[in-house]
Amino acid sequence: FTIEALPSSAAEGKDVLLLACNISETIQAYYWHKGKTAEGSPLIAGYITDIQANIPGAAYSGRETVYPNGSLLFQNITLEDAGSYTLRTINASYDSDQATGQLHVHQNNVPGLPVGAVAG
């Protein structure tokens, strides 16, 4: 499976969905980590299919929601949120798989100034 960011690049303060694409229908659990791999990277949040529950991790800020399809919604993103995010899945056979996507965040332009100008 793959991870796609919608939108691919978002201004700070906006919401971004990290969409899990082409995922198996037999997933028992989803775990989102901040980093290029799940191993050794802090857990943001998980979703357990059986009990239909979100599980907050050590890196959970309160702005993240994992949906039953495995996608991760970021609300009110900040520049610090930019980076790599890895989704680890566990299927009905207890096999684990993972994929990594990128969250790109850009600064809001100051109203009235052309792009590239610096507010004094």
Epitope: Q28, A29, G46, A53, I55, Y94
Partner: nanobody, 118 residues
């Protein structure tokens, strides 16, 4: 290592009740869910009910309003009160302990047979 021992299964008529118990030996983390799954002949094992250390309960839609799960943390025991049983509830019922943060690491009991006759 956690070991699970179920009891309370049996044969009951439709509309009747049964109470399953599952005693766990070993250390269970506070992030674990204790619960019940079932497997009917020729079907896959399915979630029935679960309960957290803090007694948050979770139920499959098919048993809501009929089954009640409870937990005694001091005794490391989980119970499943099954009322208004239906023939389609017939299955082997398995006790399970699963950690929310390591869901693929599960402990399972041997199972207890529940048969509901019409």
């Amino acid at each position: 290592q956690v070991q699970l021992q179920e009891s309370g299964g049996g044969l009951v008529q439709a509309g009747g009740s049964l109470r399953l118990s599952c005693a766990a030996s070993g250390t269970i983390s506070r992030s674990s869910i204790m619960g019940w799954y079932r497997q009917a002949p020729g079907k896959e094992r399915e979630f029935v009910a679960g309960i957290s250390y803090g007694s948050t309960t979770y139920y499959a839609d098919s048993v809501k309003g009929r089954f009640t799960i409870s937990r005694d943390n001091a005794k490391n025991t989980v119970y499943l009160q099954m009322n208004s049983l239906k023939p389609e509830d017939t299955a082997v019922y398995y006790c399970a302990v699963r950690d929310l943060y390591v869901w693929d690491h599960a402990y399972w009991g041997q199972g207890t047979q529940v048969t509901v006759s019409s």
